[in-house]
């Protein structure tokens, strides 16, 4: 049978040839009557076998951490007969481990963050070295952490790279610390091998600094023009922490000013100085008042750290501006009658300087040849007004310093101009009508209607009359429907066209206003034959078409 | 018996390239691993490179890497040196030498009588 | 790379005499030296393996000894044959590396 040992080869051997042991048959006597062979993975290329010996030889560098354990035949011949002496067999060489590999931190980069102020033995983080080296085989594989830069803030637990708080830190002196740990294999042996990994360790912010003022005193200053929320300025607190640590409120004590208001700007954390009131020079010139910031997320656990708040007194001047006329109402409305001779008086509007100075007021009516002012804001009129060509004037006056003539004001004056019955009603259009040559008596010929162009405080009622001859004239009548119309109808039976063919019938149209203003209008009346139907609208017809040149039968 | 009978040698200029042979017989040339050694005239000798029988492992001096590249075609029994980039310290004979069996597989017990190459210009 | 030192660098001995050639390696290399013969215009020949095996063929009167860093090669008696330049070679390290020579030439 086979006789061998189990085969051991040294991994990362530097010779050429490394002679691992010896595989032979009993029956060998030693005459180099037999020959070895090796067959199967790596045989002829990372093993071979003494074919007379049957030793066999590693002939490369072997890597455990690559590969463990080779399987391989072996095979023996007797050479006279070329038969196998001993049946081919399966055998193993394992690849035993040396400390060729250092631990290495596998996850880096390492980063952990830890909130400043954490008590002694808060966890940070764990690191985590892997050793390729055979774990079974001594101590080859086995670790031990070190701090080599990091004390006194930290420490690290030898056999499971915990790393931990050692000592309070304080985020404001210093952010973040680089600490480095070594792990060494062989339990920190002679002969050990060692990787070294850096941590990152950020401190967070804890809320343990309150914002104050830098400066206990802020100048500023108002212009007395400025409108209601008005930035007039900024004021600005320090906190040493950072990000919502750091974001504060300002605000102002409550006895203080109603006329400033302070809001916080939460991008810069700067408060602005608001102006919540008009403020006016000639009432008062300086303002003072005492402004306090507070952080915006205090834990209670912390309050410890913001008892009193930090205060800062600001000082407000108003700045006097030369300011425009002001006049006493915000626009004036002011009535006058039509048909007022030139020189009427209109009205009066006022208007002064609101400075210490006091400056005389000039005034005048933009774009109005209608209307005078003169200095003492006195409106009259300049020409004779007619209601029926514009009832309201649309103006505007302006206020003038005589010391300043830039400082102006305006305002809008509104002139309504009053009716006086000055126009007579009229025909509501031109009115031209027919009557036929066989109309009877009491036809209606025409609907008529009035106009009138002044303006009736009541409504307009019109009276409708005709003429004293065309009274005594019988051939046609009035009806004055009480409704502002009237119709005209035949007096007679029958017209004759050849006789008289047209008539012009005078209607007198009264109004209702005082006094009361009557027109005489014109009615024209053609007679036409219309043929047996009789009808107007037939008459009308044919006059139209006989109007139009056409001849009909 | 075993033979070893080399070829490809001659006059080149510098930085030039050849390719030199070694045609073997009387042995299971795929069973041995093969070398090629230079001398250098009147110098000692100086090992080349080395391949192992199935060529799979190869080895060259410090003084050739990279330049010199030794192969093997077993089915020839034939050992290669293609040597490139040659400088005049290049200049020897160069013979190729088999290797031994067991723990002398890196050894050489049979030598050719060697190819001459000189590099000049 | 192991440095291999041979002396003397020439011996001079007459035939029949006893030639005795020293090999020094750098650093240890076990038993794993070899020794070659060369004669003018003639490739290396084997001679010892393994320190002190002999090669097929070669005759008793030559003998190798020696381990670790350092060898020898004996010639009991030399024959007129014998007088040849002799190298030393370590093949237990990459690169393998030969020695200076000894040349052993007639007194």
């Known amino acids: 049978g086979w006789v061998w040992n189990q085969f051991f080869v040294p991994e990362e051997m530097n010779t050429t040839s490394h002679h691992i042991g010896q595989l032979r048959s009993d029956l060998d006597n030693g005459n180099n009557s037999f020959q070895y062979k090796l067959l199967g993975a790596g045989a002829g290329s990372t093993f071979i076998i003494d074919e007379r010996t049957g030793d066999i030889y590693a002939i490369q560098k072997l890597d455990r951490e690559e590969r463990s354990l080779y399987i391989l035949r072996a095979q023996v011949i007797d050479i006279a007969t070329g038969r196998a002496v001993e049946p081919e067999s399966e055998f193993v060489i394992k690849v035993s481990d040396i400390n060729d590999n250092e631990p290495k931190f596998l996850d880096e980069p390492y980063e952990a963050i830890v909130p400043e102020m954490s008590p002694e033995g808060t966890l940070v983080i764990q690191v985590t070295a892997s050793d390729a080296d055979d774990p079974s085989s001594g101590n080859n594989a086995r670790l031990l952490y070190s701090l080599l830069q990091g004390q006194p803030y930290f420490s690290v637990e030898p056999t499971t790279g915990v790393i931990r708080i050692s000592s309070k830190m304080d985020r404001e002196l210093q952010d973040e610390y680089w600490v480095i740990i070594q792990a060494k294999d062989m339990i920190g042996q002679p002969g050990a091998l060692s990787g070294t990994t850096s941590v990152l360790i950020k401190l967070s912010d804890v809320n343990d600094n309150k914002p104050i003022f830098k400066e206990s005193l802020y100048r500023l200053t108002v212009s007395e023009s400025a409108p209601t929320g008005t930035s007039i300025g900024t004021i600005m607190a320090y906190d040493n922490d950072i990000g919502e640590n750091a974001e504060m409120d300002y605000s102002i004590e409550e006895d203080d000013s109603q006329t400033f208001d302070i809001i916080t700007n939460h991008e810069t954390q700067e408060g602005i100085v608001i102006l919540k009131k008009k403020v006016d020079f000639e009432h008062q010139n300086h303002y003072g008042i005492r402004a306090k910031v507070k952080n915006h997320h205090v834990p209670e656990q912390l309050m410890k750290y913001h008892t009193e708040a930090s205060t800062t007194f600001i000082k407000i001047q108003v700045e006097d501006v030369d300011e425009p006329p002001l006049f006493l109402l915000p626009y004036y409305v002011f009535e006058v009658f039509e048909e007022t001779p030139q020189g009427s008086f209109v009205g009066v509007v006022s208007a002064t300087d609101p400075d210490n100075r006091k400056s005389p007021i000039r005034y005048s009516i933009t774009r109005s040849k209608v209307f005078n002012i003169n200095d003492n804001g006195t409106i009259t009129t300049s020409n004779s007004l007619d209601r029926e060509i514009s009832a309201w004037y649309n103006l505007s006056i302006t206020a003038t310093e005589k010391y300043n003539i830039e400082q102006i004001s305006s305002i809008p004056l509104y002139v309504q101009v009053l009716n006086i019955n000055d126009h007579a009603p009229e025909f509501s259009q031109y009115y031209e009508t027919y009557v036929c040559e066989n109309a009877g008596s009491g036809q209606v010929i025409q609907t008529i209607s009035a106009v009138d162009r002044d303006e009736s405080i009541e409504e307009h009622h019109f009276y409708f009359n005709l003429s004293v001859e065309d009274t005594n004239n019988s051939s046609f009548t009035i009806i004055d429907n009480q409704d502002n119309t009237a119709v005209i109808l035949t007096n007679r039976t029958g017209f004759n066209l050849q006789e008289e063919p047209v008539f012009y019938i005078s209607i007198l149209i009264a109004d209702n206003g005082i006094p009361s203003l009557t027109s005489t209008n014109t009615l024209t009346i053609h007679v036409c034959d219309c043929g047996d139907s009789g009808s107007t609208q037939t008459c009308q017809y044919q006059e139209l078409v006989l109007s139009m040149g056409f001849k009909t039968e | 018996q075993v033979q070893l009978l080399e070829s490809g040698g001659g006059l080149v200029q510098p930085g030039g390239s050849l390719r030199l042979s070694c045609a073997a017989s009387?042995?299971?040339?795929?069973?041995?691993?093969m070398n090629w050694v230079r001398q250098a005239p009147g110098k000692g000798l100086e090992w080349v490179s080395t391949?192992?029988?199935?060529?799979?492992?190869?080895y060259y001096a410090e003084s050739v890497k990279g330049r010199f590249t030794i192969s093997r075609d077993n089915s020839k029994s034939t050992l290669y040196l293609q040597m490139n980039s040659l400088r005049a310290e290049d200049t020897a004979v160069y013979h190729c030498?088999?290797?031994?069996?067991?723990?002398?597989?890196?050894?050489?017990?049979?030598w050719g009588q060697g190819t001459t190459v000189t590099v000049s210009s | 790379e192991i440095v291999m030192t041979q002396s003397p660098v020439t011996l001079s001995l007459s035939l029949g005499e006893r030639a005795t050639l020293s090999c020094r390696a750098s650093?240890?290399?076990?038993?794993?030296l070899a020794w070659f013969q060369q004669k003018p215009g003639q490739a290396p020949r084997l001679l010892i393996y393994g320190a002190f095996t002999r090669a097929t063929g070669i005759p008793a009167r030559f003998s190798g000894s020696g381990s670790g860093t350092e060898f020898t090669l004996t010639i009991s008696s030399l024959e007129p044959e014998d007088f040849a330049v002799y190298y030393c070679?370590?093949?237990?390290?990459?690169?393998?590396?030969f020695g200076g020579g000894t040349k052993v030439e007639i007194k």
């Open positions: 650093q240890s290399i076990s038993s794993n």
């Open positions: 070679q370590q093949y237990n390290y990459w690169p393998l590396t």
């Open positions: 009387g042995f299971t040339f795929s069973s041995y691993a």
């Open positions: 391949i192992s029988g199935g060529g799979a492992n190869t």
């Open positions: 030498a088999k290797g031994g069996m067991g723990g002398y597989y890196y050894g050489m017990d049979v």
